[in-house]
């Protein structure tokens, strides 16, 4: 039975040109995490595997940094980065847990004066 829960940063906003940390936390389970995938819609951003470490997708290598922890840092944000991001925890014996984060990238002035979402 899958007892775990994923806590995420939820809906967040950031300024164009800035950076943001995406974080998920798996709790309430003693299952072993074997791999964490970070995806944007259907695109793979990065993988952190228990035996192989981190792999950053070549198309994101310049703008994505692993960490802190199992999180992911997105840099040099553009408006095109707006959208859904998913953290997928592969665990044994529970199976797969998925968390969702919605990121809105705003023009600098908009972000300063009334962002729709607040960074927790």
């Amino acid at each position: 039975m899958m007892t775990g829960t994923i806590e995420t940063t939820g809906n967040i906003s950031a300024e164009k040109g800035g950076s943001i940390i995406l974080q998920c936390h798996l709790s309430s389970t003693t299952a072993q995490v074997t791999q964490v995938n970070w995806e944007q819609q259907d695109q793979l951003l990065a993988i952190c595997n228990a035996d192989l470490g981190w792999h950053i997708s070549p198309s994101f290598k310049d703008r994505v940094a692993p960490g802190p922890g199992l999180g992911l840092t997105l840099q040099s944000l553009t408006v095109n980065d707006t959208g859904e991001y998913f953290c997928i925890y592969h665990t044994y014996p529970d199976g797969t847990y998925t968390g969702r984060i919605f990121l809105e990238v705003l023009e600098s002035s908009v972000a300063e004066h009334g962002a729709r979402f607040q960074i927790p």
């Epitope: 003693t30 995490v33 960490g67």
Partner: antibody, heavy 117, light 107 residues
Framework: QVQLQQPGSELVRPGVSVKLSCKAS????????MHWVKQRHGQGLEWIGN????????NYHEKFKNKGTLTVDTSSSTAYMHLSSLTSEDSAVYYC??????????WGQGTTLTVSS | DIVLSQSPATLSVTPGDSVSLSCRAS??????LHWFQQKSHESPRLLIT???QSISGIPPRFSGSGSGTDFTLSINSLETEDFGMFFC?????????FGGGTKLEIK
């Protein structure tokens, strides 16, 4: 098997600089963070900073920003920490340790740095 | 920076006893808390990761619990090789930080 090899000791004069090394083997060097940790005699552990060899991305503890510089040589799978303007306060054991899915899962044996005239 | 406070600073116990070591964070770190053991003149060794995940090769008498700001490392039926220093460490945010340690000594 995973190994992080560090020289056992370094003896340097106050005011000079030193470059500590950490040679990694048994895994893909560019896929794991490399951390550096300081431990003064019989005391606690202090995180200095880390570097991701795949991109060169670094993070430093504010306290060590003007003291240490982290670099890597991916061709030899070696991480380096350059410590400058050494004083007796820098005398300590310095460990390197890697992080992938789990932080600090493998550690070097540590280099004992002695700063003395 | 996130401050990790460990208690007690020193614990004197007898082999066969069970103990609980505490680590408290100055703000929520979710489950991004890891436990290490360090014996004299040795490098630290990872015991428990992400608050409660066991590590391959570590005896099952070591277990971890907690989330948010309060964490516990439990050791059941202590053996002589279990004595030494124990540190907690957080990976929730840069800079990573360590607790000051708990010394587990033989009574």
């Amino acid at each position: 098997q995973v190994q992080l090899q560090q020289p056992g000791s370094e003896l340097v004069r106050p005011g000079v600089s030193v470059k500590l090394s950490c040679k990694a083997s048994g895994y893909t060097f560019t896929s794991y963070w490399m951390h550096w940790v300081k431990q003064r005699h019989g005391q606690g552990l202090e995180w200095i900073g880390n570097i991701f060899p795949g991109s060169g991305t670094t993070n430093y503890h504010e306290k060590f920003k003007n003291k240490g510089t982290l670099t890597v040589d991916t061709s030899s799978s070696t991480a380096y920490m350059h410590l400058s303007s050494l004083t007796s306060e820098d005398s300590a054991v310095y460990y390197c340790s890697r992080e992938g899915l789990y932080p600090f899962d493998y550690w070097g044996q540590g280099t004992t740095l002695t700063v003395s005239s | 920076d996130i401050v990790l406070s460990q208690s007690p600073a020193t614990l004197s116990v007898t082999p066969g006893d069970s103990v609980s070591l505490s680590c408290r964070a100055s703000q929520s770190i979710r489950n991004n808390l890891h436990w290490f053991q360090q014996k004299s003149h040795e490098s630290p060794r990872l015991l428990i990761t992400y608050a409660s995940q066991s590590i391959s090769g570590i005896p099952p008498r070591f277990s971890g619990s907690g989330s948010g700001t309060d964490f516990t490392l439990s050791i059941n039926s202590l053996e002589t090789e279990d004595f030494g220093m124990f540190f907690c460490q957080q990976s929730n945010s840069w800079p990573y930080t360590f607790g000051g340690g708990t010394k587990l000594e033989i009574k």
